[in-house]
């Protein structure tokens, strides 16, 4: 290899060792039967050489540094030249650097030919290996403005007092061009402007000068996005820290075309704008830092650009003035993550305050809109509190647990609407009345309607899931001991036009010790499947269900177990269950865990089941699952 | 484990010539370059020339030229460092080591092998 | 050839105390230094290389720096068994050299 540096040309050549891998041989740079280990080049120069091995790209790399003064002279300003061409150097990875300095008055501008530039984080690396990291300089101090790859949307920088780019190249790249060139600019007044331009839908993730470490003290960098007219840009902020400030504020500051409050000034921890039209501006201003204990200030966010969707220009009252104890909740149903870019898709808050969930709180009146390619990528879930602290008043009250048809009217799926009902220990306990019998979902009879009740214990200590229940069966009320939450979940759409099935009356009533009692009044044309809560789990220990099933006049019913055995072991106490006729007041008592459930009875009136678990032991829990058929009485059951 | 195991020493007549082994065992010898260092009683240290048992590929201190000649059998594991026409400049020890491509330094000594000079 | 200069043959330490030994290179050799540690009747042994990195197994209280032509390996609480003599080594440019060596003695 020759290299020859032309004199003058502020040109130094570097050679040598990379970052060490595990390769237990060496090479060396082999000058005139000397081994070296680095090579230096500069003006005027002109050097032979070879290297000891056959794959030297495995152990050294390449800089060509090239000094531009603007200090005593003109500036060469213009396309880039790569000198020497790359044609003439060995095969290394190469790094171009070239070092402009300029006075504090004068700006100096980076142009980036297509593609234009991405930044790139700590920790990530470009997927062709060409980087560029640019950094600038306040006075003696280096500032780092980034770290860049192809094909993205920064188009220019500008910076003052002079710039400092490396074009990094791994061997095998074939580039010989820089893909930028160097304008002269009037002062900018500030640390950087980093110019961002979209054609069409996409994102960018930026950084502030020395990410991840601290912003500069007391400066001022800017990103001017450049948008089309009917797309809209939306800003995120996706990791940032405050520093400790003596004197002003740290904070973020958006020119936005057509507002009439420019500048727009946000705190770092504010929700940041969205479906904002055409080109803006956003600046980071540092502060004054407390020289003891300075902190840092740092932000790393993402723009969206996508196009305006026909529900961002339509507004949606959502009016929990009424309301108490109620949260709604809009956010992103989980998907899996794809691959390609993923239009955002973001619920606004007075059209303006845009993220990608939002949660509303009653006491007030909300206006939103919907920044979103696809409204089924969201989800609605609320959460209402009922709760009773006085006993004398609360009794015998009632309320009904509807979802509001505000909520209804909005363009977004229900997925849940949790009521927490609470009620004072020991005093009083609750029952559930639907408009229309439920059925309880089971492996055997699965509901399929568009929504289901999800009933649980609410108390924080106690896992006890009553089951899910949907409209359409023979279960006529519910009633369980204390604090429960019922959970309206829906399943499909078409939810929409089944809510009028919806409706259930939660009421206050004298409190009783079992945990739960379902009273179910079978029809003639259906059989009847019912089973013990936290199914899969088990029955809590110590704990009681009972099932006031009735029977009408003319029918028979058929109690049918669907297992030999309950399965329970118990540690200490007893597992039992009692069968009682309701007229006779005659009794069979089971020992689930000892004896054989009970084959197929008939009871010719309304009886009671009555299961109480022991202290199970792990493994060995309680689980029954039985059915209730009626038949005619007419019909022979001999 | 690395080691270099190198031969006994020896006590040689001016004018002879002695030829000193260095046996690499917990490497393979091909895969790195074999340095060797003189050291005279009470002196320092001396670099004569490396290997690349590889190719055979020598590079020597000038001063050594003609003195020394190393060599290597990768089959055996085994470099050597053949001195000529000794005289009681020669007395020293005399260490093999090897040398990486991450350290570019002598990473493992052998233990030395004394060659005596002397009528 | 590059000349390696050690100026202190011997240094005179107690146990505890922190010493640094210099080594001065006739030209620059970019970081291209090592240091060595050599007890009585034993071989050389690698402490540093590249100039500040550390071989694997050397103690943490042994450090190298430096740049340019200006070496220095430092530790920072000598203890009874570093008494040796140590030698710094240019790796940048074939002739390898040595510098001749500093003699650490215990008071």
């Known amino acids: 290899f020759e290299i020859a540096l032309p004199r003058e040309s502020n040109i130094t050549v570097l050679i040598k060792l990379g970052t060490p891998t595990l390769l237990a041989k060496p090479c060396y740079i082999v000058i005139s039967k000397r081994h070296i280990t680095m090579l230096s080049i500069k003006s005027g120069e002109r050097i032979v050489f070879t290297f000891s091995c056959q794959s030297p790209e495995n152990h050294f790399v390449i800089e060509i540094q090239k000094n531009i003064d603007c200090m005593s002279g003109p500036c060469p300003f213009g396309e880039v030249q790569l000198q020497p061409s790359t044609s003439l150097l060995p095969t290394l990875n190469r790094t171009f650097i070239w070092d402009v300095k300029a006075h504090k008055s004068i700006g100096l501008e980076l142009q980036f030919s297509i593609p234009r530039l991405r930044q790139i984080g700590p920790g990530e690396s470009c997927p062709d290996g060409v980087t560029h990291s640019i950094s600038g300089r306040i006075d003696a101090t280096v500032v780092r403005i980034g770290t860049f790859c192809s094909n993205g949307t920064v188009s220019r920088i500008k910076m003052q007092e002079g710039v400092k780019m490396a074009l990094h190249l791994p061997w095998f790249h074939p580039r010989n061009v820089s893909g930028f060139s160097i304008a002269n600019r009037s002062s900018i007044k500030r640390l950087c402007i980093i110019e961002s331009v979209f054609e069409g839908e996409g994102s960018a993730t930026l950084m502030s000068a020395n990410y991840p470490e601290g912003f500069p003290e007391d400066e001022l960098m800017t990103w001017q996005f450049v948008v089309p007219a009917h797309l809209r840009a939306s800003v995120s902020f996706l990791n940032f820290n405050l520093s400790n400030c003596e004197r002003k504020e740290e904070r973020v500051e958006y020119y936005i075309p057509g507002s009439t409050t420019n500048p727009e000034v946000f705190k770092l921890e504010d929700k940041q704008p969205g479906n904002m039209a055409g080109n803006f501006n956003l600046s980071l201003q540092g502060c004054d830092q407390d020289a003891q204990s300075p902190g840092i200030l740092r932000l790393q966010f993402q723009v969206l650009v996508q196009h305006p969707q026909n529900e961002s220009n339509k507004i949606y009252v959502v009016d929990l003035s009424n309301e108490r104890a109620m949260s709604l909740t809009i956010e992103p149903r989980p998907v899996k993550q794809s691959r390609k870019f993923v239009p955002g898709c973001f619920v606004c808050l007075e059209s303006r305050t845009c993220s990608s969930n939002l949660t509303l709180t009653s006491g007030s009146k909300h206006k939103i809109s919907f920044l979103c390619d696809d409204l089924t990528r969201l989800w609605m879930n609320v959460e209402k509190t009922i709760s009773c602290t006085d006993h004398r008043y609360c009794q015998r009250k009632s309320y009904s647990l509807q979802v509001p048809s505000d909520i209804l009217h909005l363009p977004v799926e229900l997925h849940d609407f949790s009521w927490k009902l609470l009620v004072p220990k020991d005093r009083l306990s609750l029952v559930l009345v639907p408009a229309q019998k439920l059925q309880q979902h089971t492996h055997e009879k699965p509901c399929n309607t568009s929504f289901s009740y999800l009933v649980a214990s609410a108390i924080p200590s106690q896992d006890l899931y009553f089951g899910s229940f949907c409209p359409g069966g023979s279960i006529k009320q519910i009633q369980v001991k204390q604090n429960i939450s019922v959970t309206l979940r829906t399943f499909a759409p078409s939810f929409q036009q089944e809510a009028s099935r919806q409706g259930l009356t939660v009421s206050f009533i004298p409190y009783f010790k079992e945990e739960g009692v379902f009273t179910v009044t079978p029809d003639t044309k259906s059989k009847v499947y019912l089973r013990t809560p936290n199914w899969d789990r088990g029955l809590p220990s110590l704990t009681s269900v009972s099932w006031n099933i009735s029977v009408p006049r003319d029918q028979v019913a058929c109690l049918t177990f669907f297992k030999e055995r309950s399965g329970v072991v118990c540690q200490t106490g007893r597992a039992f269950m009692i069968i009682q006729e309701q007229r006779t007041r005659a009794e069979e008592i089971f020992s689930l865990d000892e004896d054989v459930l009970p084959k197929p009875s008939f009871h010719h009136h309304s009886f009671w089941v009555n299961i109480s678990n022991c202290s199970p032991t792990s493994g060995k829990q309680l689980d029954l699952l039985f059915s209730v058929t009626l038949t005619p009485r007419t019909v022979d059951l001999t | 484990e690395v080691q270099l195991q190198q031969s006994g020493a020896e006590l040689v007549r001016p004018g002879a010539l002695v030829k000193l082994s260095c046996k690499a065992s917990?490497?393979?010898?091909?895969?790195?370059?074999i340095h060797w260092v003189k050291q005279r009683p009470e002196q320092g240290l001396e670099w004569i020339g490396w290997?690349?048992?590889?190719?055979?590929?020598?590079i020597y201190d000038p001063k050594f030229q003609g003195k020394a000649s190393i060599t290597a059998d990768t089959s055996s594991n085994t470099a050597y460092l053949q001195l000529s026409s000794l005289t009681s400049e020669d007395t020293a020890v005399y260490y093999c080591?090897?040398?990486?491509?991450?350290?570019?330094?002598?990473?493992?000594w052998g233990q030395g092998t004394s060659v005596t000079v002397s009528s | 050839d590059i000349v390696m200069t050690q100026s202190h043959k011997f240094m005179s330490t107690s146990v505890g105390d922190r010493v640094s030994i210099t080594c001065k290179a006739s030209?620059?050799?970019?970081?291209?230094v090592a240091w060595y540690q050599q007890k009585s009747g034993q071989s050389p042994k690698l402490l540093i290389y590249?100039?500040?990195t550390r071989h694997t197994g050397v103690p943490d209280r042994f450090t190298g720096s430096g740049s340019g032509t200006d070496y220095t390996l430092t530790i920072s609480s000598v203890q009874a068994e570093d008494l040796a003599l140590y030698y710094c080594?240019?790796?940048?440019?074939?002739?390898?050299?040595f510098g001749g060596g500093t003699k650490l003695e215990i008071k």
């Open positions: 290997i690349d048992p590889e190719n055979g590929h020598t």
């Open positions: 917990g490497f393979n010898i091909k895969d790195y370059y």
């Open positions: 080594q240019q790796h940048y440019s074939t002739p390898y050299t």
């Open positions: 080591a090897r040398l990486t491509g991450t350290t570019y330094a002598m990473d493992y």
């Open positions: 030209q620059d050799v970019s970081t291209a």
């Open positions: 590249w100039a500040s």
